[in-house]
Amino acid sequence: IWELKKDVYVVELDWYPDAPGEMVVLTCDTPEEDGITWTLDQSSEVLGSGKTLTIQVKEFGDAGQYTCHKGGEVLSHSLLLLHKKEDGIWSTDILKDQKEPKNKTFLRCEAKNYSGRFTCWWLTTISTDLTFSVKSSRGSSDPQGVTCGAATLSAERVRGDNKEYEYSVECQEDSACPAAEESLPIEVMVDAVHKLKYENYTSSFFIRDIIKPDPPKNLQLKPLKNSRQVEVSWEYPDTWSTPHSYFSLTFCVQVQGKSKREKKDRVFTDKTSATVICRKNASISVRAQDRYYSSSWSEWASVPCS
Amino acid sequence: RNLPVATPDPGMFPCLHHSQNLLRAVSNMLQKARQTLEFYPCTSEEIDHEDITKDKTSTVEACLPLELTKNESCLNSRETSFITNGSCLASRKTSFMMALCLSSIYEDLKMYQVEFKTMNAKLLMDPKRQIFLDQNMLAVIDELMQALNFNSETVPQKSSLEEPDFYKTKIKLCILLHAFRIRAVTIDRVMSYLNAS
């Protein structure tokens, strides 16, 4: 058993049929010695008396908020949560496996630039009685500070018969140099509680590996005289690290017909313009990627050819 | 990134072309190592990230763009110098990053060159003959060092009398390639910045 927050304790249980469970001794936080009674949650049934209460915790029915009282007055609370271990593996019931980029990916994180700011998100099908807390650091043995905000519900989607809820959090490394070469990864730890179930999830990454630039901005077409060709131009996204001559991007320009089956023409360039042939009813799209470190491509920025 | 790319102007800053070749070569070598040594811990997640130049050179600090010198987090151990020499800065009156930056890059290359050559000598003794260093990568390191045109004492190649542990050598190769790729990215950024200055 260990303390998660003040008066909130996590009982780690090996979860299998007829498991013996854990014996837990609760102590009432009071100088009083006599006339103390214990109740669970808001039931009036007295579970025991005295300054300590010993319970055998085997299942969720044994967890909850234990309260000690004296003469109708509440003295203290202890909330017991359960953390299940099945076949030596901690449960991951609360969050959904996103399976991208690999199996057992519960947390996904992205950064728009090298400023040390990043966003992580996760998915669940649980709609209520859910709470999260996020901690982060650079490295784990001698951790350097990363500050994370509160996790918030950022999207709701219908997936077949199920509703899916996306939560996200923004974090900022306390003293980040955009030009630094990372040797210690960022660690992100998410505590999740659903009803009386506790779980924790972790992710470890280098900012350079989670970079995904915003799409290029101000995408414009300029027709060339007496030609089916057009000059496409665009700019670096506002959120990208500066100076751009140091933090350079490379671009992919795509001409796509109305039908998805039509052949796509693609050009790769380091410049912020390109000359392409504009077909009728086609659209031109441009996306960006760090020129020197191949992390993710941005989403496409698009304009119609007409 | 095996994709068609519009080529840059040939009359550019002489070292940029070499640094681009360097990044391409080290990235290809790292990819080859990951594939060949698939049963060894050779991915970014599995290895310890060591920097053989740590406390010996200060490339990131010395080559910091002027715009980032206002960022206190970038200035921990920054030594500024505005002396310019070395053929890469030929005829460029720039107060950006000076000899200290380029000589720091040169020292990095020299250190990695020695390590890679020592390692390759060991790998050539491996009866499995599983992996060797790409000669193209070693040649590209050499070309960039020549373009930087700094004179410094030659570092003798390390020789070891004991029997090489090939497993450890291959893991060390992965660690070295990962670190060198990161440094090659920094070098490319610096050369691109200098080219635009």
Partner: nanobody, 120 residues
Framework: EVQLVESGGGLVQPGGSLRLSCKAS????????MGWYRQAPGKQRDLVAS???????TFQDFVQGRFTISRDSAKNTWYLQMNSLKPEDTAVYYC??????????????WGQGTQVTVSS
Amino acid sequence: EVQLVESGGGLVQPGGSLRLSCKASGSIGSVTSMGWYRQAPGKQRDLVASADSNGRTTFQDFVQGRFTISRDSAKNTWYLQMNSLKPEDTAVYYCHLRGLQLTMGLYESWGQGTQVTVSS
């Protein structure tokens, strides 16, 4: 912070029914238990019924079989269905929520109360 607002109280004849609602707003996190309490004039506040996060409900003997407790999770609302009302059920009814918000810790919140009067 968690706010609770009760509604549904009023004047009802003996033998009649009322349904009280308790709507929670704010960051309620994981609710560990919910209780309905009542306070008659000049008396102390007494527990009437409660529900825990395991779905167990408990009722005091004096309302057993007449009152039921339920929850609409989507609306963050709890209900107390009161049937076969008696004059002695006259009181101000309060809802009380206990829960855990990991960024804040344990919390408890009381509603402002709703008056129930059973009289002919």
